[in-house]
C-alpha cells in the first residue's frame, strides 16, 4: 500500500494505491483511492506512466480528457466514473500488454486539494493448473496442465503422505510456446503416485503462484486449485 | 520561447549516410517526444518516426526500417536523425517537430539532397 | 496503417470566401486528427489540434469538426495570408499519417 500526500499550493489530500499484476491479454486494475470532494466537476484524475511522455489517463469535469494521451494507451483505459464521486480513481486497463509494467503515478486534484501516489505494476501471465490422473501411462502417473505462464515459472510436486519429499527426480516439466510468442503452456507430470493420498502441483513465478491439488482414492477422485498474486502491496 | 534549430543542407551520394541534428530550446527537453517527418520536393508531408528523449526508445516508419536511427544527446538537448544507404528518392526537406499527439512547433527543415 | 484521404487537392478561392476541407481516415480515429498549414519554403504550422482545438496565437476563423472518420476544416472568411497548403494528420496509431494536402490558391 502506497500513501502520498498532496504538495504545496492548495492544502494536501491523501491519495492511496495499491500495487499489483496484470495477466497479459486480459483486463486489469490499477487501484486508486482518494479523498472524495463533493462536486464531480472539480475532480481531476490524471495517470501517468514513468518513461511514458503522454498521459495514460485523464478524467476532469466529469468526463474523459484525453486529447494527451499517449497512443501505447490508446483505447484501452477507462476509470469507474459513477465511483469518481466517492474517491475511487482506478483504472481499467484494457488487453494487459507486457510493456505495461513498469511504476504509474496517480494524481488527484480536488477542491480540497492535490495529491498522488505511485504504484508499482507488474505484467505476466498466470493460470490455474489441473491435475488429473494420466490413464494413457504405464504406471500410476499425475498430469498437471496450465495453459499461460510468464516469465518461466517453477514447478513443485508435494505429497501430504510424504511430507518434505524430494519429487524432482520422479517428474518431468515442459514448457510450451503458445502461439502468441510470450506465454507458455506447462505440463508437468509425476510418475509412481500411490493411491490414498493428495499431491499438489505448485506453479510459481515472480508475480503469481498457483496450486493443483488432487486426492487419489480407490473409489474417488477429488480436484482443488488456488491462485495468489504475490505483489499486492498497498502504498 | 519553444524553438528547434536544425543542422544546415548537405549534398550527399546514392549509397552515403546523412546526419540531421535537431536542438531544442525553451522547454524541458525530455518532456514530449521528438518526430522526423520529410518532404519530397513538390510533395506531401511524410511521417519518418519519433523518440522518446528521456529513454531514448524509438518508433520508426516501417519503410524506412533499417535505414533509420535516431538517438539523442540529453545534455545538449539534441536528438539525431541518421539515414543510410541513401538514393534519389531520399531527396527531401527533413523536419523535427515536438509533441505528443501533434505537432508544434517545427524545426526549420534541412534539405538533403541525394545526388551522383 | 491509418490513410488519410483529404480532399479537394487543390481549391481556388477569393478573399473573404468561407472554405471547407475534408479528409476521411480509413478507420475510426476518435478526435485524434490535427491540421497544419503549410506556406511554401517554410515549415507546416499546426493550426487545430484534438479535431477542434484552435493553437493558441491562430486566427478564430480557422475552425475544425468532425469525429470518428470523418473531418473537415473551415476557414470563415478567407484572408489573403491564408492562401497556402493544409494538411490534416492523425495521431491514433503510429504512423501518424498526413493527407496528400490541399493547396488552396486565389481565384
Known amino acids: 500500500l502506497i500513501i502520498g500526500f498532496g504538495i504545496s499550493g492548495r492544502h494536501s489530500i491523501t491519495v492511496t494505491t495499491v500495487a499489483s499484476a496484470g495477466n497479459i491479454g486480459e483486463d486489469g486494475i490499477l487501484s486508486c483511492t482518494f479523498e472524495p470532494d463533493i462536486k464531480l466537476s472539480d475532480i481531476v484524475i490524471q495517470w501517468l506512466k514513468e518513461g511514458v511522455l503522454g498521459l495514460v489517463h485523464e478524467f476532469k469535469e466529469g468526463k474523459d480528457e484525453l486529447s494527451e494521451q499517449d497512443e501505447m494507451f490508446r483505447g484501452r483505459t477507462a476509470v469507474f466514473a459513477d465511483q469518481v464521486i466517492v474517491g475511487n480513481a482506478s483504472l481499467r486497463l484494457k488487453n494487459v500488454q507486457l510493456t505495461d509494467a513498469g511504476t504509474y503515478k496517480c494524481y488527484i486534484i480536488t477542491s480540497k486539494g492535490k495529491g498522488n501516489a505511485n504504484l508499482e505494476y507488474k505484467t505476466g501471465a498466470f493460470s490455474m493448473p489441473e491435475v488429473n490422473v494420466d490413464y494413457n501411462a504405464s504406471s500410476e502417473t499425475l498430469r498437471c496442465e496450465a495453459p499461460r505462464w510468464f516469465p518461466q515459472p517453477t514447478v513443485v510436486w508435494a505429497s501430504q503422505v510424504d511430507q518434505g519429499a524430494n519429487f524432482s527426480e520422479v517428474s518431468n516439466t515442459s514448457f510450451e510456446l503458445n502461439s502468441e510468442n510470450v506465454t507458455m503452456k506447462v505440463v508437468s507430470v509425476l510418475y509412481n503416485v500411490t493411491i490414498n493420498n493428495t499431491y499438489s502441483c505448485m506453479i510459481e513465478n515472480d508475480i503469481a503462484k498457483a496450486t493443483g491439488d488432487i486426492k487419489v482414492t480407490e473409489s474417488e477422485i477429488k480436484r482443488r486449485s488456488h491462485l495468489q498474486l504475490l505483489n499486492s502491496k498497498a502504498s | 520561447q519553444v524553438q528547434l534549430v536544425q543542422s544546415g543542407a548537405e549534398v550527399k551520394k546514392p549509397g552515403a549516410s546523412v546526419k540531421v541534428s535537431c536542438k531544442a530550446s525553451g522547454y524541458t527537453f525530455t518532456a514530449q517526444y521528438m518526430y522526423w517527418v520529410r518532404q519530397a520536393p513538390g510533395q506531401g508531408l511524410e511521417w519518418m518516426g519519433r523518440?522518446?528523449?528521456?529513454?531514448?526508445?524509438?518508433v520508426y516508419a516501417q519503410k524506412l526500417q533499417g535505414r533509420v536511427t535516431m538517438t539523442r544527446d540529453t545534455s545538449t538537448s539534441t536528438v539525431y536523425m541518421e539515414l543510410s544507404s541513401l538514393r534519389s528518392e531520399d531527396t527531401a526537406v527533413y523536419y523535427c517537430?515536438?509533441?505528443?499527439?501533434?505537432?508544434?512547433?517545427w524545426g526549420q527543415g534541412t534539405l538533403v539532397t541525394v545526388s551522383s | 496503417d491509418i490513410q488519410m484521404t483529404q480532399s479537394p487537392s487543390s481549391l481556388s478561392a477569393s478573399v473573404g470566401d468561407r472554405v471547407t476541407i475534408t479528409c476521411q481516415a480509413s478507420?475510426?480515429?476518435?478526435?485524434?486528427i490535427n491540421w497544419y498549414q503549410q506556406k511554401p519554403g517554410k515549415a507546416p504550422k499546426l493550426l487545430i489540434y484534438a479535431a477542434s482545438r484552435l493553437q493558441s496565437g491562430v486566427p478564430s476563423r480557422f475552425s475544425g469538426s468532425g469525429s470518428g472518420t470523418d473531418f473537415t476544416l473551415t476557414i470563415s472568411s478567407l484572408q489573403p495570408e491564408d492562401f497556402a497548403t493544409y494538411y490534416c494528420q492523425q495521431s491514433y496509431r503510429s504512423p501518424f499519417t498526413f493527407g496528400q494536402g490541399t493547396k488552396l490558391e486565389i481565384k
Open positions: 478507420q475510426d480515429i476518435s478526435n485524434y
Open positions: 523518440i522518446n528523449p528521456t529513454s531514448g526508445n524509438t
Open positions: 517537430a515536438r509533441g505528443i499527439n501533434w505537432f508544434d512547433p
